[in-house]
Each structure stands twice: as C-alpha cells, then as structure tokens.
Interface confidence: low
C-alpha cells in the first residue's frame, strides 16, 4: 500500500531572467527512492538516479542546475517557462509518486509588486 505523500512548493512565481528552485519532498513512507524525474508538461528536464547521479536533458543543460538535494534550479527564466512542473519519485517497493508545481514567470515590474501566488 502506498502511504507516502509528496509535499511541493505548490504555485510559485519568479521574475523573468531570474532563477527559481523547484522542490518536492516525499514523506510518510519508508520506501527507498531509486530515481526522481523532473518534467515540464511532456518534456523530461532532468533525472536524479540514486546510483548514477544527475542527468539533464540537452535542451535544458545550460539553464537547469541539479539540486539542492533532489530539487531542481531553473535559471535565466523566460515567460515560456510558465507552466506545470512535475516531480516523479520512483520508489521501492511503493511505486511512483507524483508532485505538481505551477510556475508563473512574471515581467520584472509585476514581480516587484508582489507575486500573484503564495507559497503554501
């Protein structure tokens, strides 16, 4: 039985040209995390494999940094980065857990006057 839950940063906003950290945390389970995939819609951004370390998709190599931890740092943000991001935890023996984060990239003037979303 899958008892775990994924905690995420939920809905977040960041300034165009800036950076953001995407974080998920798996709790309430003793299952072993074998791999975490980070995806944006249908695109694989990065993989963190427990044995083999990080792999980042070539299209994002220059703008995505691994970490901190199992999180992912997006750099040089553009408005096109707005959208849903998913952390997919592959665990043994539970199986797969998925967390969702919505990122909105704002023009500088909007970001300066406060984000539209609050981090839970």
């Amino acid at each position: 039985m899958m008892t775990g839950t994924i905690e995420t940063t939920g809905n977040i906003s960041a300034e165009k040209g800036g950076s953001i950290i995407l974080q998920c945390h798996l709790s309430s389970t003793t299952a072993q995390v074998t791999q975490v995939n980070w995806e944006q819609q249908d695109q694989l951004l990065a993989i963190c494999n427990a044995d083999l370390g990080w792999h980042i998709s070539p299209s994002f190599k220059d703008r995505v940094a691994p970490g901190p931890g199992l999180g992912l740092t997006l750099q040089s943000l553009t408005v096109n980065d707005t959208g849903e991001y998913f952390c997919i935890y592959h665990t043994y023996p539970d199986g797969t857990y998925t967390g969702r984060i919505f990122l909105e990239v704002l023009e500088s003037s909007v970001a300066e006057h406060g984000a539209r979303f609050q981090i839970p």
């Epitope: 791999q35 993989i47 494999n49 083999l52 370390g53 070539p58 299209s59 220059d62 553009t78 096109n80």
Partner: antibody
C-alpha cells in the same frame, strides 16, 4: 504528434551544393535543440550538427568532418530545420536524418554524390 | 572529441536468451548516454537516455546500466523483433558521437 519530415536529397556532382530541409510539427519548435545525423549505406550513424533552442541563443556546433562546409540553420516562423551542404564529396553520400532532442527522428532523405 | 567504442560488431543470441551490449567512452560522460535500436530501412529508435531511463513504450526487457566511461544495454527474453543494430551515443560534449553499432542476430 511530433513529426519530422526531411526533403531535398538527390544526386549531386562532387564539388556541388545542396540544401536539405526538415519540416516539423506537433511541438514548440523554438523550445528544442535540433540536429542532423547521417548514415552512409551499410555504415554507422554519424552526428553532424546541432542548433540550440531559443533559450540558448540558437547557437550551433559541428563535427570536424563537416565544419566549414555544412551550415545548420532554422526558420522558426515556419518550424523548418535546414542543412546547407557545400563542396560535396563522394564520402558525403548517405541518408540524412534530422532529429529533435527527446529521441524523435525523421525517416531520412538520401544524398548521392557522384559524377 | 569523445570516442565511443562498441567492442562487438555482431552478437548471435538464442531466442529467449539474454544479451549485453557494451559501450565504452574515451572520457567520462557522466551518464549522458543514449541507446538506439535501428532496423533495416528505418530511422533509429531511442530506447534509453541518461544511461538508465527507459523511453515510453520500450519493453521492460530492455535496460541500461553503467557509469563513468563504461555502459551496458541489456536485453532479456530475446524476441525476433529485437533483431536490429544497436548504437550508443554520448551527448555530454559536442560532437555528440555514436558508437560503431552492434548487430544482433538470432542463433
């Protein structure tokens, strides 16, 4: 559905030029790295050139075998990838594939360089 | 440039058997390795990226392993549709070089 369709292959004399095209659909073209790969008859795959995505300034990279002779480019308004090939040699004869980051390939177009 | 060496050009395996195809890089590629399957007259098909991550729709009989410079593609319970040529490719640094290919045949 992601689609990549190459065209422009044919028979060319040594020293000649040709431009290959790769028409794409089903994805946001500007978000992706695009590459050209070739395969001579009965031989292995050879990576030729790469053009990065919008976020990375559409910069290019080439293999030593084609650098200075081939030019990769993209028409982002029409979602088309190009490979301009100059000073063609017999050893350039191959099936040419365009490929998108993420493992999507076209079916290829064949170039024969012969007199 | 990073050279990719597939030591076996041909492998002959019995139906239902297990095969491992090896690929060695001339330098560390940090698991930025892809495996492709190509059947005659067809474009290559991506099986595995990131050394271990199976692409959607690829049977679980296929698996990838390795690290550093040495990588392996394993196929278990070999089936007739697995007859093909298999290529590794590194994409750690340009040029994104391919191995010379390993042709898999049924014994």
């Amino acid at each position: 559905e992601v689609k990549l369709v190459e065209s422009g292959g044919g028979l060319v004399q040594p020293g000649g030029s040709l431009r290959l095209s790769c028409a794409t659909s089903g994805f946001t073209f500007t978000d992706y790295y695009m590459s050209w790969v070739r395969q001579p008859p009965g031989k292995a795959l050879e990576w030729l050139a790469l053009i990065r995505n919008k976020a990375n300034g559409y910069t290019t990279e080439y293999s030593a075998s084609v650098k200075g002779r081939f030019t990769i480019s993209r028409d982002n308004s029409q979602s088309i990838l190009y490979l301009q090939m100059n000073t063609l040699r017999a050893e350039d004869s191959a099936t040419y594939y365009c490929a998108r980051d993420g493992g999507y390939w076209g079916q290829g177009t064949t170039l024969t360089v012969s007199s | 440039d990073i050279q990719m060496t597939q030591s076996s050009s041909y492998l002959s395996v019995s139906l239902g058997g297990r095969v491992t195809i090896t690929c060695k890089a001339s330098d560390h590629i940090n698991n930025w390795l892809a495996w492709y399957q190509q059947k005659p007259g067809n474009a290559p098909r991506l099986l595995i990226s990131g050394a271990t991550s199976l692409e959607t729709g690829v049977p679980s009989r296929f698996s990838g392993s390795g690290s550093g410079k040495d990588y392996i593609l394993s196929i278990t319970r070999l089936q007739t549709e697995d007859v093909a040529t298999y290529y590794c490719q590194q994409y750690w640094s340009t040029p994104f070089t391919f191995g010379s290919g390993t042709k898999l045949e049924i014994k």
